[in-house]
Amino acid sequence: MAPWPELGDAQPNPDKYLEGAAGQQPTAPDKSKETNKTDNTEAPVTKIELLPSYSTATLIDEPTEVDDPWNLPTLQDSGIKWSERDTKGKILCFFQGIGRLILLLGFLYFFVCSLDILSSAFQLVGGKMAGQFFSNSSIMSNPLLGLVIGVLVTVLVQSSSTSTSIVVSMVSSSLLTVRAAIPIIMGANIGTSITNTIVALMQVGDRSEFRRAFAGATVHDFFNWLSVLVLLPVEVATHYLEIITQLIVESFHFKNGEDAPDLLKVITKPFTKLIVQLDKKVISQIAMNDEKAKNKSLVKIWCKTFTNKTQINVTVPSTANCTSPSLCWTDGIQNWTMKNVTYKENIAKCQHIFVNFHLPDLAVGTILLILSLLVLCGCLIMIVKILGSVLKGQVATVIKKTINTDFPFPFAWLTGYLAILVGAGMTFIVQSSSVFTSALTPLIGIGVITIERAYPLTLGSNIGTTTTAILAALASPGNALRSSLQIALCHFFFNISGILLWYPIPFTRLPIRMAKGLGNISAKYRWFAVFYLIIFFFLIPLTVFGLSLAGWRVLVGVGVPVVFIIILVLCLRLLQSRCPRVLPKKLQNWNFLPLWMRSLKPWDAVVSKFTGCFQMRCCCCCRVCCRACCLLCDCPKCCRCSKCCEDLEEAQEGQDVPVKAPETFDNITISREAQGEVPASDSKTECTAL
């Protein structure tokens, strides 16, 4: 498939090409009649419907005003100004503001808790499988296998710290070398970026919101993938990460520190431990080939146990079989030796929902997965709603200016680096890059933060998670200190190297451009977002894993042609956009390929057919269910009652009329209602703080 779907002719600026988002075409079609293009690009049939009477403010706008959907929407204040309110109104408004803040914090709390439970759910569903991935002996010799194992395990357990700690315990037990561990750490870095991509999917209801949110989330993915693409071969060739970190570890005489501070966990743990508690040692034990662990449940049953180490006397066939020569004797009849035995006495059961159900891990995991995704989705919707009502007028202006404005010249370049530090600091505070980037995603979606600003924040988040790991490593026991510290430092320097590659020079900020491209595609074909997630985080790693198991020859035999085709397509794409005259006429565009290879439209038809069965069964009562429905099938009719699918008829009939973007309306409520996003009854006077 061509990298830029539906490209008829090569355009000078591929960034400006938008996959069918509202208001994106360079020229507006004839307003009075249907325009049927019959060229080989197969442009969609455009229909115009009569718009409501209030929308006399030109809805069909000049292309210059709306040609970039990446411009942040101006959330205009629809409420009465503060100065125009009476005392009662001001008091009421103040308490409304306080209430909103409490609600926002509450939903944010449950949002973070649901992320934690989502991680637990993934561990219950795929944790044991993840552990078994690690026990593969080929990791040592095949860095590519190590990489995909890192990705798969982190995706399965939804926590890079879990997969990293397994790697650390394996290195300190000499089951794995630091050299073999580095690709796994790189993979874990990729795997951890799936969380905020899942969170972005929850904003599927609004096309423009989804475009921004999905691009904002996937900028993390692309940064990690591109970093690995460059740095893994460099590491395999030079072992620079291993050498640098080894020098650091050997040059310092580290003393065991204190545990990394659990700041956010202190608040969330009291709630999450009432839902489920896991025995994470089981995954590590499976990774270390402990046969007994395979039959153990990950669900923690006993929270208070008493471990009594004792020596028991056991008979042996002869004194040659003694465990220790000094602990061996005979009573004249039998030969005896002493064996150290640990008796574990269960004292008190854990206090969580699943403690007495004795359900299999898969069942508990599935229940928690569904529930946590529903809570996550619900909280996200509410956070977006509350932020949407709060961030208007002056509040929005102040926040946006603070976050997105650069320092004055000549220090403008420093802004991004400050954002990296802020991202690192915030991640250090919340102790999780997933939580930080997931919290960032809805803010990008509603247009508070630009992708350009979210990018350094995300990069900082990557650094922040490694500083946490370094602190955790310093708190490790003596035998694990060196290995855990070296691995944490490898993680740190890998991210630093990635930043040096893809951030300092604006030209190299490829992840932003790639994420925007993916955002455009996903905004038009929302199923493509799920497709992307499955392909990049499951299918590609699993394919590489399978091919690696088959051996180097098979991997190279399949991999080389695939890589060659990808490079060929990229080179051709580059020539088409930069200097098409160099190419023969046939290769100046993708029209020489069958439609299914250069456009997502035929695939969209297939997906629509496949998901057609869901359209009749879509649930309207629940906004959350509706979002899931919209994601799958773009079905308009079923979601009308909850107004969660934008451009209902437009999506159904393939209309590509540039409707005026929300920022050009005088009233945000009108603009949203015009797009079928909020019911008319919602157009009440809004209360804003300023």
Partner: antibody
Framework: QVQLVQSGAEVVKPGSSVKISCKTS????????IHWVKQSPGQGLEWIGG?????????YKQNFRGRATLTADKSTNTAYMELRSSLRSEDTAVYYC?????????????WGQGTTVTVSS | DIQMTQSPSSLSTSVGDRVTITCTAS??????VAWYQQKPGKSPKLLIY???TRHTGVPERFSGSGSGTDFTLTISSLQPEDVATYFC?????????FGGGTKVEIK
């Protein structure tokens, strides 16, 4: 208290047999091993063998195998040693029974008073 | 069979003196060594087991040490009631074997 009471002295003719008893009290008979030790006049101690009364498993020193038979009666908490066939003058000795806690390394912590066996014509 | 060689075979010393009896095993027995005291006309009595552990009721003046092949029984301050023959015994492998004994007398 712990007691191992052995049967009285025996004077036997060469070529005959002798059976010595060791009645125990004050402890769980089945939790211990009963050993038999020979002490020739003016000599050191020599281990003959032992029996686990709980399962009647026995072991003997090589030169007593076939000559000594160890048995135990759980109902009366009594251990027996029979020195069979062709008793010789060198079998004249004091024979001790001693207990050893099964599965423990505390050695022979209690001994009987000894039974003197004299082989003479 | 493991041979246990005790030395000296007899010793005569004064009350209050420190007495040291040694026992050498013909091969490594770890710490599976016991010491017994046998007073004239009596049955043996356990003093030390596992090379250095005092049996219940044994006075503190008796102590054992050693591992491998060389073992020592020490009476820190000899008392009149300590006049007896002392035997070492190995219980590392079967058959159980005893030392020849050391006769302790008071001058």
């Amino acid at each position: 208290q712990v007691q191992l009471v052995q049967s009285g002295a025996e004077v036997v003719k060469p070529g005959s047999s002798v059976k010595i008893s060791c009645k125990t009290s004050g402890f769980f008979f089945t939790e211990y091993i009963i050993h038999w030790v020979k002490q020739s006049p003016g000599q050191g101690l020599e281990w003959i063998g032992g029996i686990i009364p709980n399962n009647d498993v026995t072991n003997y020193k090589q030169n007593f195998r076939g000559r000594a038979t160890l048995t135990a009666d759980k109902s009366t908490n009594t251990a027996y040693m029979e020195l069979r066939s062709s008793l010789r003058s060198e079998d004249t000795a004091v024979y001790y029974c001693a207990r050893w806690r099964n599965a423990y390394y505390s050695a022979m912590d209690s001994w009987g008073q000894g039974t003197t066996v004299t082989v003479s014509s | 069979d493991i041979q246990m060689t005790q030395s000296p075979s007899s010793l005569s010393t004064s009350v209050g003196d420190r007495v040291t009896i040694t026992c050498t095993a013909s091969q490594d027995v770890g710490t599976a060594v016991a010491w017994y005291q046998q007073k004239p006309g009596k049955s043996p009595k356990l003093l030390i087991y596992w090379a250095s552990t005092r049996h219940t009721g044994v006075p503190e003046r008796f102590s054992g040490s050693g591992s491998g092949t060389d073992f020592t029984l020490t009476i820190s301050s000899l008392q009149p009631e300590d006049v007896a023959t002392y035997f070492c015994q190995q219980y590392r492998t079967s058959p159980l074997t005893f030392g020849g004994g050391t006769k302790v007398e008071i001058k």
